[in-house]
């Protein structure tokens, strides 16, 4: 069976072909090349030498038991090569020699015993080690890792390293990869000697069901003293054991340690007294919870100075309060329980998302709703009941809103959005918004992007709401029941590259309303009813419009639409897709495509 | 089409098919099985992805007693920092998890349960399993 | 086992031409994918051309128009033909079969 072309004379899929060997028919310029589950079992020297532009390799699950000297010997340009769930029992010394370029090695579940015996230490390029899943015991990382002075990721996580001494690390001392972002997870660790971590710098640390008990968790935390690291993940995972006991004294040894983000990541425990339990982290930049219950929620009134929260898939007793004031970042998502949002008092905030929470807002939105002036960035997406009772009073540095899919109230009653004059984005799809007043948009001088699918209008009539947004270059009217608009409805937005008229309702096409429309590139009236044109004579559209979609309409392709088949024929350069514009009448033409037709109409008429 | 016996209780008898053309080995195990009265066990999976399980999310689709329910999305794995640790199970790397469930009060009716669940992973999405499950459901006198 | 010789190598002047062989021996190469892979002294390994059994052949841009490799299945015998010899040509010169191994190399030295 032959391997699938994803792209010529590039990628190719190989898959399960049960290949006993590397296939000899692939051109020489394949660049991605996946062997995976494939019973090679063993690779002699130079066993890609037919693929000298080759520059990922997925050899996953291939049963290779023996790498000889040199087998990627000729894969000069090969940036990653992915070895997982292979039984390795033999690597030779030069198994990986030749790969010059080599940016990410993933040797995943492959009898990897040690790093010692790894024969990576020429690897100059390397950016990712990732050893997960494998038989190691120690971390100690050897001499050679100084010449690895690229490398950005090493995971070890799922291994057996139960201990860390302070000469395990001391090649990190002489080299100091800032950049370095270690995952430790899921090996057995019962023992950090003290010091073993001193002044070394990290980027990231992720230590998660490392600990059988509370007070390994506590000595190992101790141990990680005098470490310098940018971003600290701790925490469990939902589906491996979990600690029976968890307390304030678990972190205290973060004190003795210099960290810029922290975040704890699933925790099978009810978190009461976050103050104390923090207490080491209250000067962090960044601070996150994800998939903790959290009890008491007064406690994020306290003063703490981070920057950013983060509290995503929580589960709280109800909405809690915030009271930061040096807080320029929120995010608080997918969490559960306190379905009606509070008040919020942050002074400094930015960027507020809010999404996916199943929130209901009895009015919104102003200032006091948030505590600050500075907000840039607002998402209350796909949440509950949105009660619109004020226009964004105090929030008038507001570039980015979302409310797509939440449920918007008293939006036809006043001009909502009239205070937001630096509004750049605004999604209201899909947000049973039923536009009966012409003002809806009045304000919004700056946007440039506009999403309302989903929603509906008055009569099914497009009127002139789009009159203020001169700066509009993105318009989504799909899906909004629409039978009519008025030839000026588009008269004023002279920078929209981007129309989706499509799945409406519309029977016919008129070019007369997009006269105005100087930078339209894409126009989208799919999934339409049209059957012909609104006047006979359709004038052209805009020049600059590139791509124009008229497909899956009902087209009657019949002698009196003659001029209108024609007239599509004629723009046949913009159309996409036209293999999907077909006759949906007359019944003996059904079905046929529409560009395909030759309509000769020296019929008796 | 071959059906997989996975466990009987009191009250139901599941078992389950492939719906997709690789029908990819995969092995579950409840214990104790599933009783739809109130249940509390552990599912236990042994699978070897054909492909990374990064952003995995289930496709839901249950009939009961031929009447459709909506489609249900269920995300399991978002990407980054999950609550699982397959999660971050690459392909070709062996999957051996047990999962802890419990569920209680819910009142279901006597008749035949299908649950189609497809399994999309990866970036670009693509489907990594579909299985579809047949719980019989006989709810007993007490 | 298999073995691979190789032969022709030289000092030649810049312009000119040499002839490299390659005998196989516990092996038939007419199913084999070969080639040649020179070593340059404190420079990167390159493929410097590579046949394969239904006859096509691949080239870098560095030797492409000068070098034609070829195969005699009779002789279980692979030749590279260069011509236009550069200085940058020079290096040991190895006779390859993928996946099998490699031969003790050739040197090749062009000379101004």
């Known amino acids: 069976e032959p391997c699938v072309e994803v792209v010529p004379n590039i990628t190719y899929q190989c898959m399960e072909l049960n290949f006993y060997k590397i296939p000899d028919n692939l051109p020489f310029s394949t660049k991605n090349l996946d062997l995976s589950f494939n019973p090679l079992r063993h690779l002699g020297s130079y066993s890609f030498f037919s693929f000298p532009e080759l520059q990922v390799l997925d050899l996953s699950r291939c049963e290779i038991q023996t790498i000889e000297d040199g087998a990627y010997q000729s894969l000069s340009h090969l940036s990653t090569l992915i070895l997982t769930g292979n039984p390795i029992q033999s690597l030779a010394l030069g198994a990986f020699s030749g790969l010059s370029s080599l940016q990410k090695l993933v040797a995943v579940e492959t009898n990897l015993a040690s790093l010692e015996n790894f024969p990576i230490g020429h690897l100059k390029t390397l950016k990712e080690l990732n050893v997960a899943h494998n038989l190691i015991q120690s971390f100690k990382l050897p001499e050679y890792f100084s010449n690895l002075t690229n490398l950005e990721h090493l995971d070890l996580s799922s291994n057996k390293i139960q201990s860390i001494y302070c000469t395990d690390l001391r090649v990190l001392h002489q080299m100091p990869l800032l950049n370095l972002s270690l995952d430790l997870s899921l090996n057995p660790m019962n023992f950090i000697q003290p010091g073993a971590f001193k002044e070394i710098r990290l980027h990231k640390l992720t230590l998660r069901n490392n600990f059988d008990s509370l007070n390994v968790m506590k000595t190992c935390i101790q141990g990680l003293a005098g470490l310098e690291v940018h971003r600290l993940v701790l925490g469990e995972f939902r589906n491996e054991g979990n600690l029976e006991k968890f307390d304030k004294s678990a972190l205290e040894g973060l004190c003795n340690l210099t960290i810029e983000e922290f975040r704890l990541a699933y925790l099978d425990y009810y978190l009461d007294d976050i103050i104390d339990l923090f207490n080491c982290l209250t000067n962090v930049s960044s601070f996150s919870l994800v998939s903790v219950t959290i009890e008491r929620v007064k406690d994020f009134s306290y003063n703490f100075g981070w920057q950013h929260l983060e509290l995503v898939n929580c589960k709280f007793g109800q909405f809690p309060t915030l009271k930061l004031k040096s807080l320029k970042r929120l995010t608080f998502t997918s969490n559960k329980g306190g379905n009606a949002f509070s008040e919020v008092d942050l002074p400094s905030l930015e960027f507020l998302d809010l999404s996916r929470n199943g929130l209901s807002f009895k009015g919104c939105c102003s200032q006091s709703d948030f505590g600050t002036t500075s907000l840039k960035y607002l998402d209350l997406s796909f949440n509950g009941v949105i009660t619109m009772s004020s226009n964004f009073l105090g929030l008038e540095q507001l570039e980015h809103l979302d409310f797509q899919h939440s449920n918007l109230k008293q939006m036809s009653e006043f001009s909502v959005f009239l205070s937001l004059r630096n509004l750049i984005y605004l999604d209201i799809s899909h947000t049973h918004t039923r536009v009966a007043f012409n003002g809806i948009f009045n304000g919004l001088s700056s946007l440039e992007v506009l999403k309302m699918a989903g929603n509906s209008f008055q009569e099914n009539f497009l009127p002139d709401i789009f009159t203020e947004l001169r700066n509009l270059t993105f318009l989504d009217l799909s899906q909004c029941q629409l039978e009519q608009l008025s030839p000026t409805a588009f008269n004023s937005l002279s920078s929209l590259q981007v129309l989706n008229m499509s799945h409406n309702n519309f029977f016919s096409l008129d070019t007369f309303p997009y006269k105005c429309l100087n930078s339209l590139q894409v126009l989208d009236y799919s999934l339409n009813h049209i059957m012909t044109s609104k006047k006979q004579e359709l004038q052209h559209f805009p020049s600059s419009l590139a791509f124009l979609n008229l497909t899956q309409n009902d087209f009657a392709c019949t002698c009196e639409h003659q001029s209108f088949l024609q007239w599509i024929k004629d723009q046949r350069q913009l159309l996409v897709e036209v293999e999907r514009m077909e006759c949906a009448t007359p019944s003996d033409k059904q079905g046929m495509p529409v560009l395909s037709l030759n309509i000769t109409c020296q019929m008796n008429k | 089409q071959k059906q997989y016996w996975v466990c009987n209780s009191s009250d139901a008898s599941i078992s389950y098919t492939y719906c997709d053309k690789m029908q990819y080995p995969i092995s579950i195990n409840v214990n104790p099985c599933i009783e739809l009265k109130r249940s509390k066990g552990l599912l236990h999976i042994f699978y070897i992805p054909r492909r990374d399980l990064k952003q995995l999310y289930f496709n839901l689709y249950i009939t009961v007693n031929t009447m459709n329910l909506p489609k249900r999305k269920e995300v399991i794995c978002r990407g980054s920092d999950d609550d699982y640790s397959f999660c971050r199970a690459l392909k070709g790397e062996t999957v051996n998890t047990t999962i802890s469930f419990s569920f209680k009060g819910i009142k279901f009716s006597k008749g035949k349960y299908k649950c189609v669940v497809e399994a999309i992973s990866g970036s670009p999405e693509e489907m990594l399993f579909c299985l579809e499950f047949v719980i019989l459901h006989q709810p007993n006198s007490n | 086992e298999v073995q691979l010789v190789e032969s022709g190598g030289g000092l030649v002047q810049a312009g000119e031409s040499l002839r490299l062989s390659c005998v196989a021996s516990?092996?038939?190469?007419?199913?084999?994918?070969m080639g040649w892979w020179r070593q340059a002294p404190g420079k990167q390994g390159e493929s410097v051309a590579i046949l394969k059994s239904d006859g096509t052949t691949y080239y870098p841009d560095s030797v492409k128009g000068r070098f034609a490799i070829s195969r005699d299945n009779a002789k279980n015998t692979v030749y590279l033909q260069m011509s236009s010899l550069k200085l940058e040509d020079t290096g040991v010169y190895y006779c390859?079969?993928?996946?099998?191994?490699r031969g003790q190399g050739t040197q090749v030295t062009v000379s101004s």
């Open positions: 390859i079969i993928a996946g099998r191994g």
């Open positions: 516990g092996i038939s190469i007419s199913t084999e994918i």
